[in-house]
């Protein structure tokens, strides 16, 4: 655990797993109030490596529904609309934190979990392996 | 609040903000053990919309280090290495959940926070606004 002196005014925890089990305020604060975070919504169609969104559902998790990007093509879309297979559409992946009820069905006990999601796609030059 | 009977074995919370303040196990479980999240690590250089990664550090946050993508060019890189300004490199943004110590320096009290990060860049056809 982190070596921080106990501050007065800090909640106290007698949990034997402390500091692994902590109190968390789930009234989620959004640091992005000054900008509108939903601007990138049409990139999935306008990209040279366009993607579709696929649904992943798990009722024991928050968020229960996660939409993941799947690249539409192996190659990248050229200006004329055709696909260039000399280039590759690849997913950009990012880890996100999700909450899982633990023990299951307990209304006020959760576990943080990291999952890897594909956020969108980008067009890359392929790695060419030359055979001797 | 939710009408759920108290399960035996569930942590009890006397907090006045219950259920917004809950117990969370921070022994973070990674569901992606079979995949390598570093697989996309060289895409930032090979992409037609390449990006640089900038370090954002905050000791009061978990994770304390977040890497942010910044697109290198306004346009997209062509096969010959020159930049095509008829296309746009744009950041793919994603919200991530982080934990922030609250009150500050308290080792076992946190608040969930959403922050917007740029994960990578993609090349898109620009939106052309025609003036009447």
């Amino acid at each position: 655990g982190i070596a921080i002196p106990r501050n007065s005014g800090c909640p106290n925890s007698e949990d034997k797993n402390f500091p692994r089990t902590v109190m968390v305020n789930l009234n989620i604060h959004n640091r992005n109030t000054s900008t509108n975070p939903k601007r990138s919504s049409d990139y999935y169609n306008r990209s040279t490596s366009p993607w579709n969104l696929h649904r992943n559902e798990d009722p024991e998790r928050y968020p229960s529904v996660i939409w993941e990007a799947k690249c539409r093509h192996l190659g990248c879309v050229k200006a004329d609309g055709n696909v260039d297979y000399h280039m590759n559409s690849v997913p950009i992946q990012q880890e996100i934190l999700v909450l899982r009820r633990e023990p299951r069905h307990c209304p006020n006990s959760f576990r943080l979990e990291k999952i890897l999601v594909s956020v969108g796609c980008t067009c890359v030059t392929p790695i060419v392996h030359h055979v001797a | 609040g939710i009408a759920i009977p108290r399960n035996s074995g569930c942590p009890n919370s006397e907090d006045k903000n219950f259920p917004r303040t809950v117990m969370v196990n921070l022994n973070i479980h990674n569901r992606n053990t079979s995949t390598n999240p570093k697989r996309s690590s060289d895409y930032y250089n090979r992409s037609t919309s390449p990006w640089n990664l900038h370090r954002n550090e905050d000791p009061e946050r978990y994770p304390s280090v977040i890497w942010e993508a910044k697109c290198r060019h306004l346009g997209c890189v062509k096969a010959d290495g020159n930049v095509d300004y008829h296309m746009n490199s744009v950041p793919i943004q994603q919200e991530i959940l982080v934990l922030r110590r609250e009150p500050r320096h308290c080792p076992n009290s946190f608040r969930l926070e959403k922050i917007l990060v740029s994960v990578g860049c993609t090349c898109v056809t620009p939106i052309v606004h025609h003036v009447a």
């Epitope: 789930l26 989620i28 509108n36 975070p37 939903k38 601007r39 990138s40 919504s41 049409d42 999935y44 969104l53 559902e57 798990d58 009722p59 024991e60 998790r61 928050y62 968020p63 229960s64 529904v65 996660i66 939409w67 996100i96 009820r101 209304p107 006020n108 999601v117 956020v119 969108g120 | 609040g1 939710i2 759920i4 259920p19 917004r20 809950v22 793919i92 943004q93 994603q94 919200e95 959940l97 959403k114 994960v119």
Partner: antibody, heavy 126, light 107 residues
Framework: EVQLVQSGAEVKMPGSSLKISCKAS????????ISWVRQAPGQGLEWMGG????????DYAQKFQGRVTITADESTTTAYMELSGLTSDDTAVYYC???????????????????WGQGTTVTVSS | EIVLTQSPDFQSVTPKEKVTITCRAS??????LHWYQQKPDQSPKLLIK???HSVSGVPSRFSGSGSGTDFTLTINGLEAEDAGTYYC?????????FGPGTKVDIK
Amino acid sequence: EVQLVQSGAEVKMPGSSLKISCKASGGSFRGYGISWVRQAPGQGLEWMGGITPFFGWADYAQKFQGRVTITADESTTTAYMELSGLTSDDTAVYYCARDPNEFWNGYYDTHHFDYWGQGTTVTVSS
Amino acid sequence: EIVLTQSPDFQSVTPKEKVTITCRASQDIGSALHWYQQKPDQSPKLLIKYASHSVSGVPSRFSGSGSGTDFTLTINGLEAEDAGTYYCHQSDILPHTFGPGTKVDIK
């Protein structure tokens, strides 16, 4: 097939309270939000509030704050909306609607209403 | 709260005609705009989510576009069964708000 089935029509006296139920079937209950939306005769749609069963808390429109309580019972997959201090202005059709509250296109807590109950007609009259 | 305005209020249309309904938000809501159809004595039904994304089971003649403050619902080739009232809904900032509705009837 997801279904939201609401309780039957009600006639209420001014000043009384109302409690409507919304029973969900055919899909996850816990993972979704349930919102309540009302529609006065010949009028448009008005959001009253919603609950996220996963966490158990509700958000309310300021107009109804203090007068409305939304709850959910996971064991019966049923959401409830209670409205107190009824007046004739509360005469309306009340709908429950499912909110996927999903992680969409890179963002948490994105909302829309993908399934609706059949509606409960409430008449407030003396 | 965010105010949504729709135009027109009412439209009388011939079958197979193209219908365009617009929705304007009082401030930038990104793509957090959804469209619903409500037929007389029925519950609303989701048609388009997040401004332009189709919904499973909804005919392909319904499409949406726009972002920020200006949004459009298009019905390409209206059919008799499309008569009803169309509402836009923003979910960017609580409280959720709806437009006043556009009533479409068949000539």
